[in-house]
C-alpha cells in the first residue's frame, strides 16, 4: 500500500538551514534571499514505528532523489549518513529501521531522535557551514530542535 | 473496544472459491490497515494479505495469484477470496487489525474460521 | 520467500527465564513482533517493534533484537505462560511469521 508523504524544508532552532555538501553529505548554514533555494527538500514519508499523540515514525527522502537518511555504526559509533536506495522499492510503509527517525513535537520544536539509535537525534553544530550529524546528547552546544516549513508540491 | 467478526462457508470442493468476511465493530475503520492470516492445524501461522480503506493491498507472494481481498468501508468490512482451493488449504482463517499505535502490526484478532 | 526461524521448543521450570529466539537475515534492520497463542485461541500480541509490551501485559515479558536474531524472554515464568511463541516481521512489501515455538 502506497506510504503518505510530504515535502518540507528543515530548519534548526538558530534559522540555519540545510544544504547539500557534497553528494552524501548535508551542512547547516544561515541562507537568505535567492540562496534559500539552495535548502534541501525533504520528501517525509510516514511509515512504521511507535507512534503517540506527539511521536510520529517518518523517513526523510531527498525530493526527487534516491537518497534517504539513515543511522547506521561507523567505528562503533551512531553516524548520520545518506543512503542511496533503489527508487522502485522506496518509500515504503516498512522502512528498515536505519531510515526511522521518531519526529517528536515539543513546544512547536521538532525533534528527530534514530529509531535505531534510541537518545540518538539528527543535529547540526553552533559554528556555520558544519556537516548535519547524529548526536547523543540534547540540551548541550549541539543542537537538536528543528522546524519544519512545508513545501508545496 | 475493537471486535472484529468473522464468518463464510466452511467446507469447500477443490477448484472452489474460498469466500470470507470479517466485520469491524468499535474504532475507526480508515485509521487501520486490515489483514487475513491462516494456521493449518497442528501449523504455523502465514500472512495471506492486507488492505486499507483505500482499497490498496499487499499479498503474500507464494498466494498472490489466487487471493482477492477487497473493502466494503460503508459496511466497515473486509473480505478475502481464495481461489482453486485444494486440500492444502485446509486452515483456520483469522482476520486482524494492524494499528498505528502498535507499529502497525496485528493488534486485534477475528476468532477464526475453519 | 524470506524466513525467520525459531527453536521448535523451549522447556523451563516455573520461575525460570525462557529465552526464544528468532533468526533471520538482517533481522535487527528490521522491527520484529511476538505473539502468544494458546490451544484454541487467536494469537495476543505480547512485544511490539523489537521491545514494547502492549498494555496488559506483564513485565516478565521483554524483547530485543539486533544483528540476525530478534529475542523474546519471558522472566520468573508461570504455568500460564505455557504457550505457542510465534515471531513476525516483514520482508520488502510483505509480512513474514516464524515457525513457532513450543
Known amino acids: 500500500a502506497p506510504v503518505r508523504s510530504l515535502n518540507c524544508t528543515l530548519r534548526d532552532s538558530q534559522q540555519k538551514s540545510l544544504v547539500m555538501s557534497g553528494p552524501y553529505e548535508l551542512k547547516a548554514l544561515h541562507l537568505q534571499g535567492q540562496d534559500m533555494e539552495q535548502q534541501v527538500v525533504f520528501s517525509m514519508s510516514f511509515v512504521q514505528g511507535e507512534e503517540s499523540n506527539d511521536k510520529i515514525p517518518v523517513a526523510l527522502g531527498l525530493k526527487e532523489k534516491n537518497l534517504y537518511l539513515s543511522c547506521v555504526l561507523k567505528d562503533d559509533k551512531p553516524t548520520l549518513q545518506l543512503e542511496s536506495v533503489d527508487p522502485k522499492n522506496y518509500p515504503k510503509k516498512k522502512m528498515e529501521k536505519r531510515f526511522v527517525f521518531n519526529k517528536i513535537e515539543i513546544n512547536n520544536k521538532l525533534e528527530f531522535e534514530s529509531a535505531q539509535f534510541p537518545n540518538w537525534y539528527i543535529s547540526t553544530s553552533q559554528a556555520e557551514n558544519m556537516p548535519v550529524f547524529l548526536g547523543g546528547t540534547k540540551g548541550g552546544q549541539d543542537i537538536t530542535d528543528f522546524t519544519m516549513q512545508f513545501v508545496s508540491s | 473496544q475493537v471486535q472484529l467478526q468473522q464468518w463464510g462457508a466452511g467446507l469447500l470442493k477443490p477448484s472452489e472459491t474460498l469466500s470470507l468476511t470479517c466485520a469491524v465493530y468499535?474504532?475507526?475503520?480508515?485509521?487501520?490497515?486490515w489483514s487475513w492470516i491462516r494456521q493449518p492445524p497442528g501449523k504455523g501461522l502465514e500472512w495471506i494479505g492486507e488492505?486499507?480503506?483505500?482499497?490498496?493491498?499487499n499479498y503474500n507472494p507464494s498466494l498472490k495469484s489466487r487471493v482477492t481481498i477487497s473493502v466494503d468501508t460503508s459496511k466497515n468490512q473486509f473480505s478475502l477470496k481464495l481461489s482453486s482451493v485444494t486440500a492444502a488449504d485446509t486452515a483456520v482463517y483469522y482476520c486482524?487489525?494492524?494499528?498505528?499505535?502498535?507499529?502497525?502490526?496485528?493488534?486485534?484478532w477475528g476468532q477464526g474460521t475453519l | 520467500q524470506s524466513v525467520l526461524t525459531q527453536p521448535p521448543s523451549v522447556s523451563v521450570s516455573p520461575g525460570q527465564t525462557a529465552s526464544i529466539t528468532c533468526s533471520g537475515d538482517?533481522?535487527?534492520?528490521?522491527?520484529a513482533f511476538w505473539y502468544q497463542q494458546k490451544p484454541g485461541q487467536s494469537p495476543v500480541l505480547v512485544i511490539y517493534?523489537?521491545?514494547k509490551r502492549p498494555s496488559g501485559i506483564p513485565e516478565r515479558f521483554s524483547g530485543s533484537n539486533s544483528g540476525n536474531t530478534a529475542t523474546l524472554t519471558i522472566s520468573g515464568t508461570q504455568a500460564l505462560d505455557e504457550a505457542d511463541y510465534y515471531c513476525?516481521?516483514?520482508?520488502?512489501?510483505?509480512?513474514?511469521f516464524g515457525g513457532g515455538t513450543k
Open positions: 513476525y516481521a516483514w520482508a520488502d512489501t510483505y509480512e513474514v
Open positions: 517493534l523489537d521491545n
Open positions: 488492505i486499507d480503506h483505500s482499497g490498496s493491498t
Open positions: 538482517k533481522l535487527g534492520d528490521k522491527f
Open positions: 486482524a487489525r494492524a494499528s498505528p499505535s502498535s507499529g502497525w502490526t496485528l493488534d486485534y
Open positions: 468499535g474504532g475507526s475503520f480508515s485509521d487501520y490497515y
